[in-house]
């Protein structure tokens, strides 16, 4: 194809892939008629003068995991066509100014992963029809005025995983196209207010693993088309009453792994679009009425992990859409008997690892579509009669490692239980405590009377009966709803965000996907 | 229908302890917060603490917290408020109160008048 | 502790008359705001919460407004059983506060 390098493969759509670490330089000569090129996984150390001279029809180059560390000046010269430039994962300390000069065509640049030390504005002076630039991932400590002034037209800028520790309100004032900014991973302490006032036209915003410990009031108020706000792992320990107040179009809001120790009414909204909120890993106490309220979309409130001792009775007013509410791992007692009146769409509710001492009989009394409840693990003794009577949907109850108190009060419990066992799953059982001749016993087999022999056993009425059906969907342990190997923080929608971690702790987790954390 | 019944009008001398109770019915006592709101003459509503009857734990305003305990007996549906070392200033109408759908007072107890007099 | 300030603490109607009364509270407390009536000897009863929604029972011509730290209680048309002592209550944090209250007194 008009003469392949032997080092290279070359397809007749004009595309050339060059890899393999006997690759020292650019193989030469490069099919004339060339459109993209790809120099991968070779031992390049650097580019020289015009290596790219006779192939001018070349739209995408893409240099990436060499050992690339030095770029001559007009390395890219003659590439008046290029639309695509990556020279990620490489070795890059220093950028030539002037390299990308007469890229005019250029759209993406991507200098991810290297070694960059820092930026100026004349780097990119001349890329005026750049849409991506991927910094993310190098050495850069500050962001000089004026470095993107002239990239008017990007819609995407990564500046993840660098060494930022502060920005100026003005790096960003020209990029009113800009939809996506990440600025992940860096050290940022704090961001000063009128930093993204001209990102009117933003739709991501990362934040999170910095160390931001503030946020200014009114920091967000000019992006409305806000989508996506990732603000998880940083040190925020309060939200100011107004700040998320203009956000109509989120959806999409991660607050996990702060410092929260309050969620003041009205914090939240109006946000009608907003479908999940991650709040777990706070320090969060309790939750006042209608703190969620302007939520009327919502489908998943993650709450785990927090210090939640006291839920008022209108804490989730509003919440008509939820689906899934994690309350795991906190320091509920008590719960009012109106908490839970609201949701009525909930299907998954996650309580274990708390104090519950008593559940209040009607609790779930609104919530007749509950496919899932998780109650393992907290100071349960016993239920009220009938508490799970209305639930025909549900198909998984956890109840083990609670402290069954097996007298003749326990009978309409056990009764339903064993009626309904396939739902409670074949791992863990819940086993009585008390009294102590049948401790560790299952609650579900065991004889009452044996239990408390000195005791009248009076006719209990039992549980009505709800039986198990067949043909409803059963989960067996591996495919579980709150299967033990989980996503322990919510998935962004780019793999360079979040590390997905797993684990095998029933005792912490035991919740759906999305109620993990 | 859900009803609150409270105890008689008391007098007492100051230094002295009061207990009011709050008798329950048309509804599950131990499922529900019941709170506790006083009313001195001329003077604005004062909330003093809450109790859940299922548990019996407590939360209390901190000007009255060492003074006040909040306790129940559940198989008698019955809520009690104490205040200890009186004072002429705790003259008041005591009010149990039950939340409705959220945090605010849907159900009133009478009210019980406590006279500090020496 | 949250402070809610009433305001007027008194005033002076006649059947028909509109009449306002508003309350501020010290600190944002969202829509967490609930209205009062008490009339002599007797237990408050509840009005309006969440601001702005009326109790079961409560007339039409009783309506609340605001978010925040400044709400309103209205009543369109005042009737001669609404004279009675207004209460507004915060429930956004302990200790929950009431206002000082406003007489609705006949003119």
């Known amino acids: 194809y008009h003469g392949c390098p032997s080092e290279c493969t070359c397809s007749r759509a004009s595309q050339v892939e060059c890899t393999g670490a006997r690759i020292v330089a650019v193989p030469t000569p490069l099919p004339w008629n060339a459109m993209s090129l790809q120099i991968l996984n070779t031992h390049i150390t650097e580019l020289n003068e015009s290596p790219f001279l006779n192939i001018s029809a070349l739209i995408a180059l893409r240099i990436e995991k060499n050992e690339l560390s030095r770029i001559t000046p007009g390395a890219f010269r003659n590439l008046g066509s290029l639309r695509y430039l990556s020279l990620a994962n490489n070795k890059l300390q220093v950028l030539p100014i002037g390299l990308f000069q007469g890229l005019d065509s250029l759209e993406s640049l991507l200098l991810s992963s290297n070694q960059l030390l820092q930026i100026q504005p004349a780097h990119f002076s001349q890329c005026s029809n750049l849409k991506e630039l991927q910094l993310h991932g190098n050495h850069l400590e500050y962001i000089p005025d004026g470095a993107f002034d002239h990239l008017v037209g990007l819609t995407k800028l990564n500046l993840g995983k660098n060494s930022l520790t502060h920005i100026s309100p003005r790096v960003f004032q020209h990029l009113g196209n800009l939809q996506v900014l990440r600025l992940y991973e860096n050290r940022l302490t704090d961001i000063p207010m009128g930093t993204f006032d001209g990102l009117v036209n933003l739709q991501e915003l990362a934040l999170q693993q910095n160390q931001i410990g503030l946020l200014s009031p009114g920091l967000f108020h000019n992006n409305h088309n806000l989508q996506r706000l990732y603000l998880s792992n940083n040190h925020i320990s309060q939200l100011p009453p107004s700040v998320f107040m203009q956000l109509p179009q989120l959806n999409r809001l991660t607050l996990f792994g702060n410092s929260l120790k309050e969620l003041s009414p009205g914090i939240f909204g109006p946000m009608p679009n907003l479908r999940e909120l991650w709040l777990y890993d706070n320090h969060i106490s309790s939750l006042p009425d209608n703190v969620f309220s302007n939520l009327r979309q919502l489908q998943v409130l993650i709450l785990s992990r927090n210090q939640i001792s006291f839920i008022s009775p209108g804490a989730f007013n509003g919440l008509t859409e939820l689906r899934e509410l994690s309350l795991h791992t906190n320091a509920l007692q008590d719960l009012d008997g109106n908490v839970f009146r609201m949701l009525a769409n909930l299907q998954n509710i996650s309580l274990q690892n708390n104090r519950l001492r008593q559940l209040p009989g009607n609790i779930f009394a609104n919530v007749n579509g509950l496919m899932a409840i998780q109650l393992q693990n907290n100071q349960l003794e016993n239920l009220p009669l009938g508490i799970f009577d209305h639930l025909g949907k549900l198909c998984e109850l956890r109840l083990y490692d609670n402290p069954w108190r097996c007298d003749s009060d326990i009978l309409p419990l056990r009764n339903w239980l064993l009626l309904n066992q396939p739902r409670l799953g074949t791992d863990t059982v819940p086993v009585c405590f008390s009294p102590a001749n049948v401790r560790g016993q299952s609650l579900i087999i065991i004889n009452v009377n044996v239990a408390v022999p000195s005791v009248h056993v009076p006719e209990v009425p039992s549980y009505p009966e709800t039986p198990w059906y067949p043909d409803t969907p059963s989960y067996p342990d591996t495919t579980s709803v709150s299967s033990t190997t989980e996503l322990t923080s919510p998935v962004e929608d780019y793999t360079d965000l979040t590390t997905i971690q797993v684990t095998d702790d029933r005792s912490v987790w035991g919740m759906t996907q999305a109620q993990s954390g | 229908q859900v009803q609150l019944v409270q105890s008689g009008a008391e007098v007492k001398k100051p230094g002295a302890s009061v207990k009011v109770s709050c008798k329950a019915s048309g509804y599950t006592f131990t499922d529900y917060y019941i709170n506790w709101v006083r009313q001195a003459p001329g003077q604005r509503l004062e909330w003093m603490g809450w109790?859940?009857?299922?548990?019996?734990?407590?939360k209390y305003n901190e000007k009255f917290k060492g003074r006040v305990t909040i306790t129940r007996d559940t198989s008698a549906s019955t809520a009690y408020m104490e205040l200890s070392s009186l004072r002429s200033e705790d003259t008041a109408v005591y009010y149990c109160?039950?939340?409705?759908?959220?945090?605010?007072?849907?159900?009133w107890g009478q009210g019980t008048l406590v006279t500090v007099s020496s | 502790d949250i402070q809610m300030t009433q305001s007027p603490s008194s005033l002076s109607a006649s059947v028909g008359d509109r009449v306002t009364i508003t309350c501020k509270a010290s600190q944002n407390v969202g829509i967490n705001v609930a209205w009062y009536q008490q009339k002599p000897g007797k237990a408050p009863k509840l009005l309006i919460y969440s601001a702005s929604y009326r109790s079961s029972g409560v007339p039409s011509r009783f309506s609340g407004s605001g978010s925040g730290t400044d709400f309103t209680l209205t009543i369109s048309s005042l009737q001669p059983e609404d004279f009675a002592t207004y209460y507004c209550?915060?429930?956004?944090?302990?200790?929950?506060?009431f206002g000082g209250g406003t007489k609705v007194e006949i003119k």
């Open positions: 209550q915060q429930y956004s944090s302990f200790p929950y506060t």
């Open positions: 109790i859940y009857p299922g548990s019996g734990n407590t």
């Open positions: 109160a039950r939340w409705g759908y959220g945090a605010y007072f849907t159900y």
